[in-house]
């Protein structure tokens, strides 16, 4: 029945036109300046994002919202005044000019206007709530900003002190390098002197060789005389044997006693025809003392004597000097063969040392030293290594030159601390050095950031504890 239309006039005011029968009523309302138009809809959750807004931007946005609030309030007051004025005027006009039945229409129009006013008020209340909401959020963000600023300041301070420490360490290392350079120059000079001495020796040897060659010629002549004498002797022996064979009255009483087979290392076991992996009894050099060891007869040609194995953490490696001396554990599992046996063995002939490593991600690597031996107990089983190759780091994770062996009750390291007690296990600790294959065994997912674990620095770094390790030796001429 009522035809109600809303449009804009040329000067930007809103027109409310009501058609009722043959009469039409037009209301001109003032437009707000700063209200958001329908073409740019308001996003109520604009501040709900992961990354905090920039502080300045937030302040500007807040000021804009405050202005809008003020404008909305003014507009609402204007609208109320306007409606009241219009209502008065219209009521007078209606009373004067309109037919009686138009009164109802006017009341209806008034009601519509009042409803619209209420709607606007409700919208304003929403805007007000949003502004409050946004203000709270901005306050929280400001708090977050100040907290993160404090955190950053603390981190910067920590890093600055760390940088200072590193600089100190760097200068210390620089001094060390300079000292090494000086040492190197001295060594070069001594090598040069040795070279000169060797040249003198070579010339002496050349003259000796000439003399020997002359003697060989003389010996060749003598040799032909000796060969004739030998031939004569052979004939005499044959004659004697013929004479003896006639008198075979008694049998030979000597019976060969069954001798115990003994092996010095797994290379000897291998060469005797026993080519399967397993535990074999080995005999100490120049002794009857025996020890059992695991022999790897497959890896890299076989003949490897296993001197250390870690694989599951079943054996405690925090042992005494005596235990590391004589060995502990079981050759089929985790064990240490014993420093005394290894020392005696590696001082008999030249041995190579192979260290096989496994990490928790399924990777394997090795370090091979082409010459390895241990000093005697009097020299604390000091390790001696030469010629590193392999995939577990280009630099030796066993400090060079070799260090003395240390245990929880035998501190021979180069640290004021006790490396063996601190890092656990017996090892050739420096101060404390880049390796310890006898450290604490840590299971998977607990094996990182562990200073006292099974460490091989130049393969996995300082905090990584390995899954499995094997140390094995074999004669260099195998």
């Amino acid at each position: 029945y009522n035809n109600f239309r809303k449009s804009m006039d040329s000067i930007g005011k809103k027109q409310y036109q009501v058609q009722h029968g043959s009469c039409s009523y037009t209301f001109l309302l003032p437009e707000m300046d700063n209200c958001r138009s329908s073409s740019s809809p308001y996003v109520s959750n604009a501040v709900q994002r992961d990354a905090p807004l920039e502080y300045d931007d937030s302040v500007q946005r807040l000021q804009v919202l405050e202005n809008i609030m003020e404008n909305n309030t003014q507009w609402l007051m204007k609208l109320e005044n306007y409606i009241q004025d219009n209502m008065k005027k219209e009521m007078v006009e209606i009373q004067q000019n309109a037919v009686q039945n138009q009164t109802a229409v006017m009341i209806e129009i008034g009601t519509n206007l009042l409803n619209q006013t209420a709607e606007q008020t409700r919208k304003l209340t929403d805007v007000e709530a949003q502004v409050l909401n946004q203000t709270t959020r901005l306050e929280l963000q400001l708090l977050e900003h100040s907290l993160s600023t404090n955190k950053l300041e603390k981190q910067i301070l920590d890093q600055t002190s760390e940088i200072n420490k590193l600089q100190d360490k760097n200068s210390f290392l620089e001094k060390k390098v300079l000292a090494m350079e000086d040492k190197h120059i001295i060594q070069l000079q001594s090598i040069k002197e040795e070279k000169d001495q060797l040249q003198v020796l070579v010339s002496k040897q050349n003259s000796i060789i000439e003399e020997l060659e002359k003697k060989i010629v003389t010996a060749t002549v003598n040799n032909s005389v000796l060969q004739k004498q030998q031939h004569d002797l052979m004939e005499t022996v044959n004659n004697l044997l013929t004479m003896m064979s006639t008198s075979n009255s008694a049998k030979d009483p000597t019976v060969a006693k069954e001798e115990q087979i003994s092996f010095r290392d797994c290379a000897e076991v291998f060469k005797s025809g026993h080519t399967t992996n397993g535990i074999y009894t080995l005999t100490f050099p120049n002794s009857t003392e025996e020890i059992k060891a695991y022999c790897d007869m497959e890896a890299g040609g076989g003949g490897w004597t296993i001197i250390q194995r870690r694989e599951d953490g079943s054996v405690d490696f925090q042992r005494t000097w005596k235990e590391y001396k004589v060995g502990f554990g079981n050759p089929s599992g985790e064990y240490w063969l014993g420093n005394e046996f290894v020392s005696q063995l590696t001082n008999q002939q030249r041995y190579v040392l192979k260290i096989h490593l496994k990490d928790w991600e399924g990777n394997e690597a090795y370090s091979l030293y082409e010459h390895f031996y241990l000093s005697s107990e009097e020299l604390n089983y000091r390790i001696h290594l030469k010629g590193l190759t392999g995939t577990a780091g280009k630099i030796s994770s066993i400090s060079q030159p070799g260090n003395d062996f240390s245990t929880k009750d035998g501190d021979n390291d180069k640290c004021i601390c006790k490396c063996s007690q601190m890092l656990t296990g017996g090892w050739w600790f420096d101060a404390c050095g880049p390796s310890n294959l006898n450290g604490m065994y840590y299971p998977q997912r607990q094996n990182t950031n562990k200073f006292n674990g099974i460490k091989w620095y130049y393969w996995k770094g300082s905090g990584y504890s390995l899954k499995a390790t094997t140390m094995m030796i074999r004669p260099a001429d195998f």
């Epitope: 535990i279 074999y280 009857t288 059992k292 005596k322 004589v326 554990g329």
Partner: antibody, heavy 119, light 107 residues
Framework: QVQLVESGGGLVKPGGSLRLSCAAS????????MYWVRQAPGKGLEWVAT????????YYPDSVKGRFTISRDNAKNSLYLQMNSLRAEDTAVYYC????????????WGQGTLVTVSS | DIQMTQSPSSLSASVGDRVTITCKAS??????VAWYQQKPGKAPKLLIY???TRHTGVPSRFSGSGSGTDFTLTISSLQPEDFATYYC?????????FGQGTKVEIK
């Protein structure tokens, strides 16, 4: 836990034969050297035989060499001692024993089985 | 073969006494000596290895010492359950050989 149980002992005439068995459990049998040790009535302990993990190496004292044979079946976790040409001086309680690993000190012993050689 | 000679072959002692048993090897065996305790009708029990290392669960009143050829087992304060026969054994080389035993009896 580790258990060693001997069986097969009994009375036998001089010159006769007997086979002793030792059933092992509670450990990886194929990882250890195994031993037979005997004790004559009222006397001390005497080592009789040793066998390596794979059975390739066997060791005996002169008193039993050539008459006794130690063997093992790793699949059955069993140790054996075949005793031939038995003598009266072989009468003893026979123990099977397991060492610690690297050296032959005996951590685990069976309860023993008595062998009596008598006419 | 290495011979192990124990002394005394028997001794009488009272509860609370300090008891010492000695063992002599026919050649240098370093510290490769073990000690066992045996009670009548039972299998021997390991007490000590490497001359002085106590086996798991062995009371601290049992101690061992020595190296080379001379070794000692000491019971600091004899308890009723300690009356038994004790054997030394060298684990230096094959064959592993035992001492003839020392019987500790109640006085």
């Amino acid at each position: 836990q580790v258990q060693l149980v001997e069986s097969g002992g009994g009375l036998v005439k001089p010159g006769g034969s007997l086979r002793l068995s030792c059933a092992a459990s509670g450990f990886t049998f194929s990882d250890y050297y195994m031993y037979w040790v005997r004790q004559a009535p009222g006397k001390g302990l005497e080592w009789v035989a040793t066998i390596s993990v794979g059975g390739s190496f066997t060791y005996y004292p002169d008193s039993v060499k050539g008459r006794f044979t130690i063997s093992r079946d790793n699949a059955k976790n069993s140790l054996y001692l075949q005793m031939n040409s038995l003598r009266a001086e072989d009468t003893a309680v026979y123990y099977c024993a397991r060492d610690w690993g690297l050296r032959p000190w005996f951590v685990y012993w069976g309860q023993g089985t008595l062998v009596t050689v008598s006419s | 073969d290495i011979q192990m000679t124990q002394s005394p072959s028997s001794l009488s002692a009272s509860v609370g006494d300090r008891v010492t048993i000695t063992c002599k090897a026919s050649q240098d065996v370093s510290t490769a000596v073990a000690w066992y305790q045996q009670k009548p009708g039972k299998a021997p029990k390991l007490l000590i290895y490497w001359a002085s290392t106590r086996h798991t669960g062995v009371p601290s009143r049992f101690s061992g010492s020595g190296s080379g050829t001379d070794f000692t087992l000491t019971i600091s304060s004899l308890q009723p359950e300690d009356f038994a026969t004790y054997y030394c054994q060298q684990h230096y080389s094959t064959p592993p050989t035992f001492g003839q035993g020392t019987k500790v009896e109640i006085k």
